[in-house]
């Protein structure tokens, strides 16, 4: 009998049956799992792998630098010492962490995947899951915070710093738990016949849960912003009948609409393809999900690069702070915000993020 060998990593089959005792494969190579899922485990760097890695590392560096800049800006400028900005800083921290996680992935992908053990592979995925969960949870927290402020007709919530810290701790606890779930048991190491194709050590059921969890979060955000927009529109129309300045109100509303469209549009564009792909992996046996996986992962990661742009670079005060940091200029107003300074500063952000405020008066 001729002996056989292959240079391509391969995967095996069902290990759980009614008659069989479950078997666990903690000491198996990554190739073992990939060979059973039908996912190609590269032996050498091809053009696509090089392109993905090059682009990925570039995006990572931008993500980390941009989000670091956001965090520093919020720290140094006392005008940003409000709950919404603390949440934005936490979002930047989550996105910074996503950059680190993706950086780690980039150096442990393609042919380098073969070198990973079961535990380091789970760490690689867990870091990504944690960072992306934190990012999404922050987006949701910001949406909730804006919803509260708009409906209470405030520029900033009266939320205490302590409560903000609690929210931030909850976000990271949730993110860490979500990232750790597969490592602590919800995987297919002892259930080999239920491994997914896209993530060969993850169970099909976890991928479905992960995708639905994120899609539901997305829907909640859509509902919150739609509610905010509906409310602002209603208030603006009502006020324009009793006010001599409907133009400004309309501009404010359009600013809000524009930002909501950008925020949700970025989220949809970056996240939906990957999440749908996870569902297709499990629900559509004939779909070649593996062909698009790398690009959709990059797309999801782009969301972490876009958040600083969307949430911060549209803010004039934030832009000015960035310039001061980058040009090593001293802040002209490092002290805490007065009512006046806060109201006049960052007017664009207040119309956008605060939702319903114009430069010098509330439209609600």
């Amino acid at each position: 009998m001729a002996a056989i060998s292959t240079s391509i990593p391969v995967i095996s089959q069902p290990q759980f049956t009614a008659m069989n005792e479950p078997q666990c494969f903690y000491n198996e190579s990554i190739a073992f799992f990939y060979n059973r899922s039908g996912k190609h485990l590269a032996t050498e760097w091809n053009t696509v792998s090089k392109l993905v890695m090059g682009l990925g590392i570039t995006v990572c560096i931008f993500i980390m630098l941009a989000n670091l800049l956001v965090m520093v800006a919020i720290y140094v400028n006392r005008r940003f010492h409000f709950p919404i900005y603390y949440l934005m800083a936490n979002l930047a921290a989550a996105d910074f962490f996503a950059g680190l996680a993706y950086f780690y992935l980039m150096f442990n992908t393609g042919p380098n995947t073969r070198r990973l053990t079961v535990s380091t592979w789970l760490l690689r995925q867990g870091l990504i899951d944690t960072s992306l969960t934190a990012s999404v949870a922050n987006l949701l927290a910001i949406a909730i915070e804006r919803h509260i402020t708009v409906f209470r007709m405030q520029l900033h919530t009266r939320m205490s710093n302590r409560r903000v810290v609690v929210v931030i701790v909850v976000i990271w606890t949730m993110a860490i738990v979500m990232g750790a779930i597969p490592s602590v048991g919800w995987n297919c190491i002892c259930d080999i016949e239920n491994c997914s194709n896209m993530a060969p050590l993850y169970s099909d059921s976890y991928l479905v849960f992960w995708a639905i969890f994120n899609l539901v979060t997305f829907v909640v955000m859509v509902v919150l912003y739609a509610h905010i927009f509906g409310y602002v529109r209603q208030r603006t129309m009502r006020m324009s009948r009793h006010s001599s300045g409907p133009r400004r109100n309309r501009d404010t509303m359009m600013s809000l609409l524009k930002t909501v469209v950008i925020v949700l549009g970025a989220f949809i564009i970056c996240w939906t393809p990957g999440l749908v792909l996870l569902l297709l992996d499990v629900c559509c046996p004939q779909c070649d999900v593996l062909a698009y996986e790398k690009f959709f992962l990059l797309l999801a990661e782009f969301n972490s690069a876009m958040n600083p742009i969307i949430y911060s670079y549209r803010d004039k005060e934030m832009s000015a702070t960035f310039r001061q940091i980058l040009c090593c200029q001293r802040s002209e107003n490092p002290t805490g915000p007065t009512e006046g300074s806060d109201r006049s500063a960052s007017s664009l952000n207040h119309t956008i993020l605060a939702g319903v405020h114009s430069n010098d008066h509330s439209v609600v």
Epitope: M1, A3, I4, S5, T6, I8, V10, I11, S12, Q13, P14, Q15, T17, M19, N20, Q23, F25, A31, F32, N35, R36, S37, G38, K39, H40, E193, C195, N197, P285, Q286, C287, D288, L290, A291
Partner: antibody
Framework: QVQLVQSGAEVKKPGASVKVSCKAS????????ISWVRQAPGQGLEWMGE????????YYNEKFKGRVTLTADKSTSTAYMELRSLTSEDTAVYFC???????????????WGQGTTVTVSS | DIQMTQSPSSLSASVGDTVTITCRAS??????LAWYQQKPGKAPKLLIY???TLTEGVPSRFSGSGSGTHFSLTINSLQPEDFGIYYC?????????FGQGTKLEIK
Amino acid sequence: QVQLVQSGAEVKKPGASVKVSCKASGYTFTSYGISWVRQAPGQGLEWMGEIYPRSGNTYYNEKFKGRVTLTADKSTSTAYMELRSLTSEDTAVYFCARESISRRLGWNFDVWGQGTTVTVSS
Amino acid sequence: DIQMTQSPSSLSASVGDTVTITCRASENIYSFLAWYQQKPGKAPKLLIYNAKTLTEGVPSRFSGSGSGTHFSLTINSLQPEDFGIYYCQHHYGPPLTFGQGTKLEIK
């Protein structure tokens, strides 16, 4: 019902190539891997390689690497095995066989083609 | 590569007998072992996978056991249609290898 129908017998000269087809029916072609196994006269079974039509991934026996190419045409639900640089030792019955499990690779085969006899003779 | 060794290479038995064929792997393959039956001029037929799981439609007189490196196929109460060549095959992952076969003949 689920079946794999292979192309007819072939007689080839040494150094030539042969391409054997395996048409699948009765199931979703892309959901199952297809392996190729050969059996020389009076001998045992020898695995040549496998293709997973869902992704197009291929897995080869090192013994045949560079000489065999596995392809799949999703539109016609047909798998192909091409063997090049034939010698008399390649005279055998070539079987295609379907994975027993869908959406992943189990590496055992529950549905087999009827076999294609390839004779290499000068 | 994983080598599969079957024994015996052939055996004769009568209808109604119980026979056991063994298969040894050169390294640990957990329970990733399949058994096939082949009749002359026909394609192999999958009987058992995962060492002990019977394929649909296979009579319960066939049973498999073992894990790691030692496996066996037992046929209780042999029937005339059970004669043929039996192969074991590991399905741990590529490269796949088969045993050299055990020819089961009628006595």
